[in-house]
Each structure stands twice: as C-alpha cells, then as structure tokens.
C-alpha cells in the first residue's frame, strides 16, 4: 500500500508549487524502509555495490559536472543548475568556459578552470581547504571539497558567490540520489539537507541512507555484518 | 581607507643595494587573498612590474630583474620591502607599491597605489 | 613575455569628443586591464576584465576587446581626462604594462 501526501513545498526556483510525496507502508504496520535500513535491515546496496545506484550515482556526476550557478536577476537567490534549468530572461547562468575562468592559481595563470562556477563556492574565496601549493583544487567540481571556511569578506565582486543560496544537496530515498533542493522540499520528502554542502558530488547519500557505521570509504558499501543483525 | 606609502633612500651610488619599504594602512596582508606588488616608473617614461608578495608568502618576480631582487613583509608591522641588489644607473625611477585586489575579477589588478618614492642612483 | 602595444602614443581631443585608443597584445590574452596617471600622480585603475568600471570611475569609460585587440574609450572627452592611459596584462608573467598613450586636451 502506499501513503499519498501532498503539500504546497517552496521550490528551486523561488515559487511553492504542489508536490507529491508517495511512502511504500509496511504491509506489517510497522516502521517504515529507510527506518528499517537504518535498523539494520539486509539491504543489499548497504552491504556491497549495487550496480544500478553506482550508475544512478555517476550519471548524477555528469550532470553535475556541467552545471553553474543560476542567479536570479531580482537577487531573490541562486542555486545550481544545468543551463537549460535556469531562465534566459530572469536569471544569469553563471559557467566558466573557455577562456572566461579565473586561473587554476596565482603561480599557474595560463590554464583556466572551465569546471564551475558554483554557487556559494569558489577556490579563490575559499580559506580551509584553501586551493594552493600542492593542494589545488582540480578543474572537475565535482572533485572539489566542502569548503569549511570562507574568506572574511561581505562581499566578493562574484555573482554566484554574493546571491543568497537557495538549495543545497538533499539526499532522498532509499536508493541513495541526491538532488540540489530547498530546505523546505527536502524535509517534505523526508531528505536529508546539506546545509555544509554545495555540491552533490561532495556528499554521500548511500552512506546516509544506511546509516550505522559508516562506510570505511564513503563510496564502497560494507556494512557485511547486516547479515547477522537481521 | 586604505593607503600605501613608499619610502627610500633618494639617492645612492651605483653597486649599492636599494632599500624600499611600503607601509600600508586599511589592509592587512595576512588576510587571505590579498597581495601587495612593487612597479617603477623611470622619468618620463612606462610602468615596469617588479615583484609581488602574497599573504601566503607566495612571491613573483620580473625574470629579467629576479636575480637583484628580494621581496619580503612583515605582516604585524603592516609593511613589504623590497631589495634591488648592485643598482645601476638605468635604476633610477619612481618606485610605486600597490595592493592587488580580485574584487569581481577572475585575474586580480592593483586598485590602489602609494604616491611613490623618487631614487636616483648617481656616482 | 607579452608585449602590449598602445596606440596612438600620443593624441588629442576637444571636450565632448569621443576617443578611442587601443591596445594590442603579442599574443592572447584573456582580459585586459587599464589605468589612468595624471601628470605628478600615481596610477589609477580604471578598468579590469577588459569591461568592469572600477570603483568610482565615470561611466564615460569604457573598455572592450578579446584576444589580442582591446581598447578604451572615453564617450565624451572631459578636462579632467587628459592623462597618460596604460594597458596591462595578468595572463602570464611577467606582468607587463603598455608603453601608454597620452591623452590631451584641445
């Protein structure tokens, strides 16, 4: 049987619209499945790779990889995006590309970062982990860390650094995917928010969803003792 | 308000070493990104890039110059030096400092300049 | 190095005019930087990105370009212009400047 809600959310693109949130019950009456997972339950994508996620989780990658940050003109907010998502008329998409990116560094001014822009995050601005020596970010966000201190600064000169954020990564389901949502839309959907987070790429739903010990390599599930828990 | 202040010898002889000290208020270089160069201006004629230090202590110089020049700061006394080994005669000129700012800048530019310190090197 | 060539070196114009000056690079460059020195004063950025007025200065400026071909423009000439105006470059060190072009007031 399935649970129905349905609720009036704030949405990506700054307007609530009707939303849909479908719950599969327990047949048993009882907790639900992520309540479950997180029990202890044998879920195979807990105890090792699932092929289907691992596919779900690249494909969410490359996307991701060629987003930007979309600003909305009104300064009502920014999130990130791929193009075709952010309004030619309302909104300024924000993408290096080119040769219209900072460089890769001070000591290196010949090669442009082409990956990028993100909203709210930028190696020039970015103190701890700060992107120099030989701890440059790479040109691929989606291999950039969560940045844990901002420079000291009101304001930057940047778009997408100086809009305020309006979603953020939002892990949602059992299967682990993750989308860049509101606050309000991911509690709907019973998500977890990343509020430290900017990117998909930098959070690991299925290590979320499973819960218990975390997995030794966020990427690689092993949660093998599952098998005696249940 | 931000300002910078050069201050040098005025005059001095060739083979000597130059001393220059920038002084600068309204700033600190030991806040993240920000930078502080040295340009000089001969009499009369075009702007020359010399050196840049970083608030990382990252520091680049002018190849055609880098083996007389020594740059360096001392971010508590909120100043950056500059050394020029063995002047010459070709060295005299109006030496600027200037703070680099990358405000809405994917590269950085000097937006702000002392008003300069005039050296002649004269035997 | 990049070498940055401005021209005209020297040139005039009468209040109200529209003046334009340009700089070439010896080779590409993706932004261009400009600075206005009046006689006895420091350097000023006006502006960076190519395109971006800098803090303060007066609309009548502007800058465009790409590659290797940039210029300056002034859309109506005013006393307080005439100046020496330098170009220069951050895409690769050294950092290099234009000789400049000085801009006069018929």
């Known amino acids: 049987a399935q649970h129905v809600t349905t609720q009036l959310v704030l949405r990506n693109k700054g307007v609530y619209e009707s939303v849909k949130y479908i719950q599969q019950e327990n047949f048993w009456i009882g907790p639900s499945s992520i309540d479950l997972i997180h029990l202890g339950a044998k879920f195979s994508p807990c105890i090792r790779k699932d092929q289907q996620i691992e596919q779900l989780v690249l494909r969410e990658r490359d996307l991701e990889r060629d987003s930007g940050c979309c600003v909305q003109n009104d300064h009502s907010g920014c999130i990130q995006t791929q193009r075709k998502d952010c309004s030619e008329t309302l909104a300024t998409f924000v993408k290096w590309q080119d040769d219209t990116g900072p460089p890769m560094d001070k000591s290196d001014l010949g090669q442009k970062r082409t990956s990028g822009a993100v909203c709210h995050q930028d190696p020039r601005t970015c103190e701890e982990p700060a992107s120099s020596g030989a701890h440059i970010w790479p040109d691929d966000i989606t291999k950039w860390p969560i940045c844990t201190e901002q420079a000291k600064s009101n304001r930057t000169g940047f778009l997408h650094m100086d809009c305020q954020i309006k979603g953020r990564p939002c892990c949602i389901s059992t299967k682990g995917s993750c989308e860049i949502t509101t606050r309000e839309y991911c509690e709907f959907m019973h998500g977890y928010f990343h509020e430290e987070a900017t990117l998909c790429s930098q959070v690991h739903c299925l290590d979320k969803v499973c819960g218990l010990l975390p997995f030794l390599n966020p990427e690689v599930p092993d949660q093998f003792y599952r098998l005696w828990l249940s | 308000q931000v300002t910078l202040k050069e201050s040098g010898p005025g005059i001095l002889q060739p083979s000597q070493t130059l001393s220059l000290t920038c002084s600068f208020s309204?700033?600190?270089?030991?806040?993240?990104?920000?930078?502080v160069g040295w340009i000089r201006q001969p009499s009369g004629k075009g702007l020359e890039w010399l050196a840049h230090?970083?608030?990382?202590?990252?520091?680049y110089y002018n190849p055609a110059l880098k083996s007389r020049l020594t740059i360096s700061k001392d971010t508590s006394k909120n100043q950056i030096f500059l050394k020029i080994a063995n002047v010459d005669t070709a060295d005299s000129a109006t030496f600027y400092c200037?703070?680099?700012?990358?405000?809405?800048?994917?590269?950085?530019?000097?937006?702000?300049w002392g008003t300069g310190t005039t050296v002649t090197v004269s035997s | 190095q990049i070498v940055l060539t401005q021209s005209p070196a020297i040139m005039s114009a009468s209040p109200g005019e529209k003046v334009t000056m340009t700089c070439s690079a010896s080779?590409?460059?993706?932004?261009m930087y400009w600075y206005q020195q009046k006689p006895g004063s420091s350097p000023r950025v006006l502006i960076y990105?190519?395109?971006n007025l800098a803090s303060g200065v007066p609309v009548r400026f502007s800058g465009s370009g790409s590659g290797t071909s940039y210029s300056l423009t002034v859309s109506r000439m005013e006393a307080e212009d005439a100046a020496t105006y330098y170009c220069?470059?951050?895409?690769?060190?050294?950092?290099?400047f234009g000789a400049g072009t000085k801009l006069e007031l018929k």
């Open positions: 200037a703070r680099i700012e990358n405000y809405g800048s994917n590269y950085w530019y000097f937006d702000v």
């Open positions: 309204g700033f600190s270089l030991s806040t993240f990104g920000m930078g």
């Open positions: 230090i970083w608030w990382d202590d990252d520091k």
């Open positions: 080779s590409s460059v993706s932004y």
């Open positions: 990105d190519t395109s």
């Open positions: 220069q470059q951050w895409n690769s060190y050294p950092l290099t």
